[in-house]
Interface confidence: low
């Protein structure tokens, strides 16, 4: 399938001009080589009109001209003073003309419309507001106003100042007599129809002395705006429909054949299921606009898209509507990333999110796509040191591999991790990509205590359990904060039992602190990588207390000998806590995509019960 | 360009019914784009206007002397418009050409864009 892109069909009227952008990818040697446009004979040739490199058809003299825009990948064809004699077929193109690499465009010129003498002519969108202003004298300020419409050969009653108003119009059409000052009184048409074209009649006065005004309303179905996105990517539809529709139920459809147009999404919940986890409807303003972006473009998301306006939410008659023609090229400059990891509760993931190398500079975010109403994408982490509060110790974004790839690392893992996640940057939008993370069954590789304290001026080790699968890889343990995780020293340990089906090949790396300090309190992470490739890691917090007094008890002993109901403020407490910080969903505040950064997002725990098995699948 | 072509006429009398086709063909990549009509033409007189549609069929609109009489259609999938004529009379001999627009507009000034060769239809009486 040829890569370029253009408008299938370019309609004008007689001796006016057309402007046609075509697109393509825009490697280096697509920017450089020739540009063309042609016209298609009848026996298949295609015969050069215009080209980059300098070539003007005598036809074309004086009123055409092509121009390259390398940084967008696109080049624009300008003709003026059109000619029925100009449609045809043509093809817009690189290289060589019948080389493939091009797309066919369809131009129509019509004859302008025969019109009688002082005819006003009202052109309007479709589902648009149309307002034919009708002057009139002094003598007739007083008499019947009215609108009529050319129905055949007879004029048909639309609306009066008596009150009549057509039954085709009801609701939907008003006649305004402005103030004594003005001799003029207006007839406003909303939510217009196809059907509403015409010509129309007003007139003040009913006898000779009638003051009389033609007017013509051509209502036109919006042309297509042409978008070019890459594979994979992102595309963002930008709605303007007026502030007359503000209140009224949006809508994004995709035409599929004649006139059906299928709901992608709109603002009364619905979603396509195609569509789930790579779509957002974002909040419209006061005026009504709003927009929406679908990543992880697919090669069946090409094609036609309105927004409207309307109470259904769906395309109905008297839509107000904006159109876009998709096209989506697959000589994609975005890499193939898995659009699906799988990680076992207590477990982790690795996440691969790519970017624009262009952009290495740019901030990195990682948001957690919500289905709920219209769809949104609260910021969990982000490349500048901020992760959302209850994410704190299992969440952290890394400019590594670099290069066009960053990685997030999500680990202790739940069933409700479960969902759709976006990879985005501060720079190009249209790389913003999509993950789906799904939980599976099974237990996680990496194994570590499910609780630890440690004790002041004391050495702690923590031992990590890996399988015989990950000898090959490079082990580490780091300790976690906001910007990442700080690689620390660590020792390898020789065989382990955790592992009894790994022929003794099973394996740890502990951790050790010498000498604990206050500072030395937090979450440790254990894991496993090749190169700048993340694998597998498991999380353990660590706590700090107090040397125990000479002859004190053992707080090991106090947790045993504790009433079921008694307040134990050692390690179990802790372990409850880390359930509450583990569980993602315990916490109201959001962070947008488009949201500031918000420094107050300190939060409470929700402490609920639970073994450390269910949480992290930690062997003891 | 949009090449329009009519089929069905012919030779009737007077009170019978015939069915008049035209098929779009060529850049047809979106005829549901297009408004529809039906003009005919008697010998000696001007082209006059019979019937229009528009892009879904959900608006329609007729001549005078043809209402409750003809009744015209449109298949998008088939790229097709129909005229189905009733009650024919000798009034209603001529040729009769089907017609495109970019935009549909209803009474008699149909913006045409696009004409088609035409078929004769006679009425005998």
């Known amino acids: 399938k040829s890569p370029i892109f253009g408008p299938e069909e370019v309609n004008s009227v007689e001796g006016n001009s057309v402007s046609i952008t075509c697109y393509y990818p825009p490697t280096s040697v697509n920017r450089h080589t020739r540009k063309y446009w042609c016209r298609q004979g009848a026996r298949g040739g295609c015969i050069t009109l215009i080209s980059s490199e300098g070539y003007v058809s005598s036809k074309y003299a004086g009123r055409a001209n092509l121009t390259n825009f390398p940084e967008n990948g696109t080049f624009v064809v300008n003709i003026a003073q059109l000619s029925q004699d100009d449609s045809g077929r043509y093809k817009c193109g690189l290289g060589i003309n019948s080389r493939g690499l091009s797309f066919d465009v369809s131009l129509e010129v019509s004859q302008g419309p025969g019109l009688l003498n002082d005819t006003k002519v009202y052109t309007v969108d479709l589902g648009r507001t149309v307002t034919i202003n009708c002057p009139f004298k002094t003598e007739n300020a007083q008499k019947r106003k009215s609108l009529y419409k050319q129905i055949g050969l007879y004029p048909v009653l639309v609306i009066d100042s008596s009150g009549y108003v057509n039954p085709n119009y009801t609701g939907r059409i008003r006649l305004d007599i402005q103030g004594t000052g003005q001799l003029l009184f207006s007839v406003v048409i909303n939510q217009l129809r196809l059907s509403d074209a015409g010509q129309y009649l007003c007139q003040a006065g009913d006898d000779s002395n009638s003051n009389k005004k033609n007017a013509d309303l051509q209502v036109l179905k919006p042309e297509p705006e042409l978008v070019y996105e890459d594979l994979r990517g992102s595309v963002t539809f930008h709605c303007a429909l007026g502030p007359e529709v503000a209140n009224v139920a949006k809508f994004l459809c995709r035409q599929s054949s004649g006139e059906n147009c299928d709901v992608v999404v709109n603002t009364l919940g619905k979603r396509a299921p195609a569509f789930e986890g790579r779509i957002l409807l974002n909040p419209q303003d006061k005026d009504g606009s709003f927009s929406v972006v679908i990543t992880g473009l697919r090669k069946e998301d090409a094609g036609r898209y309105l927004c409207g306006a309307h109470s259904d939410g769906q395309l109905q008659e008297g839509s107000p509507i904006q159109a876009w023609q998709l096209f989506v090229n697959e000589e994609s400059t975005i890499p193939r990333s898995p659009t699906v990891v799988k990680g076992v509760a207590g477990g982790s993931v690795a996440v691969l999110c790519p970017y624009n190398r262009k952009e290495s500079k740019s901030i990195k975010y990682w948001c957690l796509w919500e289905g709920a109403q219209n769809g949104r994408c609260p910021l969990l982490v982000d490349s500048e040191g901020w992760v959302k509060a209850q994410y704190e110790g299992r969440l952290s974004l890394l400019e590594e591999p670099g290069n066009g790839t960053f990685t997030v690392i999500l680990n202790q893992l739940t069933s409700r991790d479960a969902g759709f996640y976006w990879c985005l940057t501060n720079g190009d939008t249209l790389w913003r990509t999509t993950v789906e993370i799904k939980i599976i069954e099974g237990e996680p590789n990496l194994k570590v205590p499910g609780n630890v304290t440690a004790v002041l001026g004391e050495t702690l080790k923590v031992p990590c359990h890996f399988p015989c699968k990950f000898s090959s890889y490079e082990k580490y343990w780091c300790k976690w904060n906001n910007t990442g995780c700080q690689a620390l020293p660590s020792q390898d340990e020789g065989p382990s039992k955790a592992f009894v089906n790994c022929d003794e090949n099973s394996r740890l790396v502990s951790l050790t602190l010498n000498l604990v300090t206050r500072a030395d309190e937090g979450w440790y992470w254990c894991g496993v990588k090749q190169g700048h490739f993340y694998g597998e890691t498991a999380a353990v917090y660590v706590a700090v207390e107090e040397r125990k007094a000479a002859g004190s008890r053992d707080v090991s002993l106090a947790k045993a000998d504790a009433a079921p109901d008694e307040k134990v403020l050692d390690s179990g407490f802790r372990e409850i806590e880390n359930k509450a910080i583990q569980d993602p969903r315990l916490f109201a505040e959001e962070k947008a995509v488009a949201d500031t950064r918000d420094q107050a997002d300190g939060s409470r725990a929700s402490v609920d019960s639970g073994s450390s098995e269910e949480q992290g699948g930690s062997s003891r | 360009e949009v090449q329009l072509v009519e089929s069905g006429g012919g030779l009737v009398q007077a009170g019978d019914s015939l069915r008049l086709s035209c098929a779009a063909s060529?850049?047809?990549?979106?005829?549901?784009?297009?408004?529809m009509a039906w003009f005919r033409q008697a010998p000696g007189k001007e082209r006059e206007f019979v019937a229009s549609?528009?892009?879904?069929?959900?608006?329609?609109d007729y001549a005078d002397s043809v209402k409750g009489r003809f009744t015209v259609t449109r298949d998008n999938a088939k790229n097709t418009v129909t005229l189905r004529m009733n009650s024919l009379k000798p009034d209603d001999t001529a040729v009769y050409y089907c017609?495109?627009?970019?935009?549909?507009?209803?009474?008699?000034?149909?913006?045409?864009?696009?004409w088609g060769q035409g078929t004769q239809v006679t009425v005998s009486s």
């Open positions: 549609i528009d892009y879904n069929g959900g608006s329609t």
């Open positions: 017609a495109s627009a970019r935009y549909y507009r209803s009474g008699t000034s149909f913006p045409v864009n696009y």
């Open positions: 060529g850049r047809t990549l979106s005829f549901d784009t297009y408004a």
